[in-house]
Interface confidence: medium
Amino acid sequence: EELQVIQPDKSVLVAAGETATLRCTATSLIPVGPIQWFRGAGPGRELIYNQKEGHFPRVTTVSDLTKRNNMDFSIRIGNITPADAGTYYCVKFRKGSPDDVEFKSG
């Protein structure tokens, strides 16, 4: 069965200064490749978190991504401000050479 990316929460309400939890799960280990979180869609979308590389000081993962069969890619974003408002997408990439390829979005 083909991998699905599931974002169960249609909206999340967070007070300024608090932490937002954005939930995302995948239904399969295959295809192998990282999850990335974006705010917005299309060419101008903003990268919020990349599981594979980069430094995202306000973002932590909800679960231990080093555990074998954990397919929970939920994140927490700390110290929320009004500027963080928007629609967030959890996107699965397929591992490729030389570049990973977008596979499916929540």
Partner: antibody, heavy 121, light 112 residues
Framework: QVQLVQSGAEVKKPGASVKVSCKAS????????ISWVRQAPGQGLEWMGW????????NYAQKLQGRVTMTTDTSTSTAYMELRSLRSDDTAVYYC??????????????WGRGTLVTVSS | DIVMTQSPLSLPVTPGEPASISCRSS???????????LDWYLQKPGQSPQLLIY???NRASGVPDRFSGSGSGTDFTLKISRVEAEDVGVYYC?????????FGGGTKVEIK
């Protein structure tokens, strides 16, 4: 680029300890575990254990339990493997390998170049 | 511990010809999630091992399509459809179904 760089060769006396380092670069260190694998001269591969870079949880091979300690320093993206009470049969090349990044990779997809540890009186 | 048995121990091959390596485990490597936790690695002379196949049949990134993995449960096979000179080295299967991970004894592939 994505790589694991290991510390240099060591020569130790029986009964001594050795600590091998493995510095990761080019990827998010805490998204992948680290396994340590050793290879005695002319022999096959032996898995020593695994550490979660996320929370420091470890899983050691039973035969090394009590002699091996695996740690990480997330501030420098470095994993360490310390082996104590060294014996001559611990002479081997010690490899670190990137392991178990959920959904990102499965098992040992990136290896260091190895560190030769020689135990000799 | 799960015991991994590889055969043959040594495999002389002719470039352009196919080659096959067998790996058998003492316990099933089929996880309840439907995946077989069996990998294949190649250690070329003087180098670190490199991942070829994961989860029994999935080629790792950058691995040529002449390599394929098959099998389920306790019996697995690595096939090279047409051996090239650069394929020489020692091939290892490894189970990651349970800890400790265990490797097969290795199969040395050399050119005839």
């Amino acid at each position: 680029q994505v790589q694991l760089v290991q510390s240099g060769a060591e020569v130790k006396k029986p009964g001594a300890s050795v600590k091998v380092s493995c510095k990761a670069s080019g990827y998010t260190f805490t998204s992948y575990g680290i396994s340590w694998v050793r290879q005695a001269p002319g022999q096959g591969l032996e898995w020593m254990g695994w550490i979660s870079t996320y929370n420091g949880n470890t899983n050691y091979a039973q035969k090394l339990q009590g002699r091996v300690t695996m740690t990480t320093d997330t501030s420098t993206s470095t994993a360490y493997m310390e082996l104590r009470s060294l014996r001559s049969d611990d002479t081997a090349v010690y490899y670190c390998a990137r392991d178990q990044g959920t959904g990102t990779t499965v098992d040992l997809d990136l290896w260091g170049r190895g560190t030769l540890v020689t135990v000799s009186s | 511990d799960i015991v991994m048995t590889q055969s043959p121990l040594s495999l002389p091959v002719t470039p352009g010809e196919p080659a096959s390596i067998s790996c058998r485990s003492s316990q099933s490597l089929l996880h309840s999630n439907g995946y077989n936790y069996l990998d294949w690695y190649l250690q070329k002379p003087g180098q670190s091992p490199q991942l070829l196949i994961y989860l029994g049949s999935n080629r790792a990134s950058g691995v040529p399509d002449r390599f394929s993995g098959s099998g389920s449960g306790t019996d697995f096979t690595l096939k090279i459809s047409r051996v090239e000179a650069e394929d020489v080295g020692v091939y290892y299967c490894m189970q990651a179904q349970g800890t400790p991970y265990t490797f097969g004894g290795g199969t040395k592939v050399e050119i005839k």
